[in-house]
Interface confidence: medium
């Protein structure tokens, strides 16, 4: 988790002088409780936006937006703490909006936005906005939280972001798998424009089961430049195991930008359909 570096972070708007500060995520207002605290944020919305860095890289960001309730508690609102928690790692990043002037009611509802938290493809986050100061212990909560799922690199807009392109999102291998005679599979895929090696990982399964009955790894050396974007054809020999008929072929590239952590592509061959066996006709007809 990190903040986008592309410009100074601002939260000021007409009628409010405000500054954005780094936060330890441990605001001290519960250590120094106040008698009067503001109410919760209203209508917290999290959306996927995209933003460029100064270097021109494109990153997915969480666009956080919320409004204030139209009650007198805005007179005691001193700012907000924005927290993003990555659910699978417990990593948390916070910033604090610090209001340098008092809020006043005006003809429009106060609205705040922040679009600087960089998020990762295919990750889920919990986004929380706390109004400050936080309430006294055992008081009524004044925060709102929402979960936010970032699409993976198959998503059209995500595909062209720097993290996705670095992991090989633009490569479409267009894998085809063909079953040949004599227990063989013919795998064909399109090479990318980089002189790097590939690995074909074959895993076979019985018809209706998920534990593998055969595994095989095949190394493909780095292509020469004249082979870029050409089809690579590989014939894999299967183990002659009755019923080991469902095959998953996975192609793992080793691009320089992602090494052994590049996006993998796969194709599956299903077991052949079994013809319905008709009832056997008896050799003789019983007389009784």
């Amino acid at each position: 988790l990190r903040l986008l570096d592309h410009r100074a972070l601002v939260c000021s708007q007409p009628g409010l002088n405000c500054t954005v500060k780094n936060s330890t995520c441990l605001d001290d207002s519960w250590i120094h409780p106040r008698n009067l605290t503001p109410s919760s944020p209203k209508d917290l919305q999290i959306q996927l936006h995209f933003a460029h860095t100064q270097q021109g890289d494109l990153f997915p960001v969480a666009h956080i937006e919320w409004t204030l309730q139209t009650d007198a508690s805005i007179l005691y609102l001193e700012g907000a703490e924005l927290s993003v928690l990555q659910l699978n790692t417990n990593e948390r990043l916070c910033v604090r909006f610090e209001f340098l002037s008092k809020l006043r009611h005006h003809h429009r509802r106060w609205r705040f936005t922040f679009s600087h938290f960089v998020v990762d493809p295919d990750q889920e986050y919990e986004v929380t906005v706390h109004h400050l100061p936080k309430p006294i212990p055992d008081g009524d909560p004044n925060h709102q939280s929402k979960n936010f799922l970032v699409p993976d690199c198959e998503h059209a807009r995500m595909k062209v972001t720097t993290p996705c392109m670095s992991s090989g999102s633009l490569w479409d291998p267009n894998i085809t798998v063909e079953t040949l005679e004599a227990h063989q599979l013919r795998v064909s895929f399109t090479l990318w424009n980089e002189s790097t090696h590939y690995q074909i990982l074959l895993t076979s399964f019985p018809h209706m089961e998920n534990h593998s009955c055969f595994e095989h790894m095949h190394h493909i050396p780095a292509p020469r430049p004249e082979e870029f974007h050409q089809r690579s054809n590989v014939t894999l020999t299967l183990r002659n195991l009755k019923g080991c008929c469902r095959h998953q072929v996975q192609i793992q590239p080793f691009f320089s930008s992602c090494l052994n952590d590049c996006l993998r592509h796969s194709a599956t061959v299903s077991c052949p359909e079994m013809p319905d066996t008709p009832e056997p006709i008896p050799d003789y007809m019983p007389l009784w």
Partner: nanobody, 119 residues
Framework: QVQLQESGGGSVQAGGSLRLSCAVS????????MGWFRQAPGKKREGVAS????????HYADSVKGRFTISQDNAQNTLYLQMNSLKPEDSAMYYC????????????WGQGTQVTVSS
């Protein structure tokens, strides 16, 4: 059901040390905030120290900075408060609390452990 159980309180001379423990059980969240609070007779409950279990970041009240240390043992699901250079004004009932958000507005509380510092 989340349960917190404090231990380690007692009586000590000024300048002495105590280590409070808080055993946590039943928490389903992977990461949460924990804090030590204290309440002396006739006074409001006040925050002493807090920790975020996700990354171990900590926060202290000015009155205990440099003397108290909050820490965690994830394997044992235990929170600690090491209290050094104790003063008579540190005498209070000490409570630990856990909360998924760092607000302690609806936390889980322990029963408390008494700390008495005599001069």
């Amino acid at each position: 059901q989340v349960q917190l159980q404090e231990s380690g309180g007692g009586s000590v001379q000024a300048g002495g040390s105590l280590r409070l423990s808080c055993a946590v059980s039943g928490y389903t969240h992977r990461s949460y905030y924990m804090g030590w609070f204290r309440q002396a007779p006739g006074k409001k409950r006040e925050g002493v120290a807090s920790i975020y279990t996700g990354d171990g970041s900590t926060h202290y009240a000015d009155s205990v900075k440099g003397r108290f240390t909050i820490s965690q043992d994830n394997a044992q699901n235990t929170l600690y408060l090491q209290m050094n250079s104790l003063k008579p004004e540190d005498s209070a009932m000490y409570y630990c609390a856990a909360d998924t958000q760092n607000s302690f507005t609806a936390p889980y509380w322990g029963q408390g452990t008494q700390v008495t510092v005599s001069s």
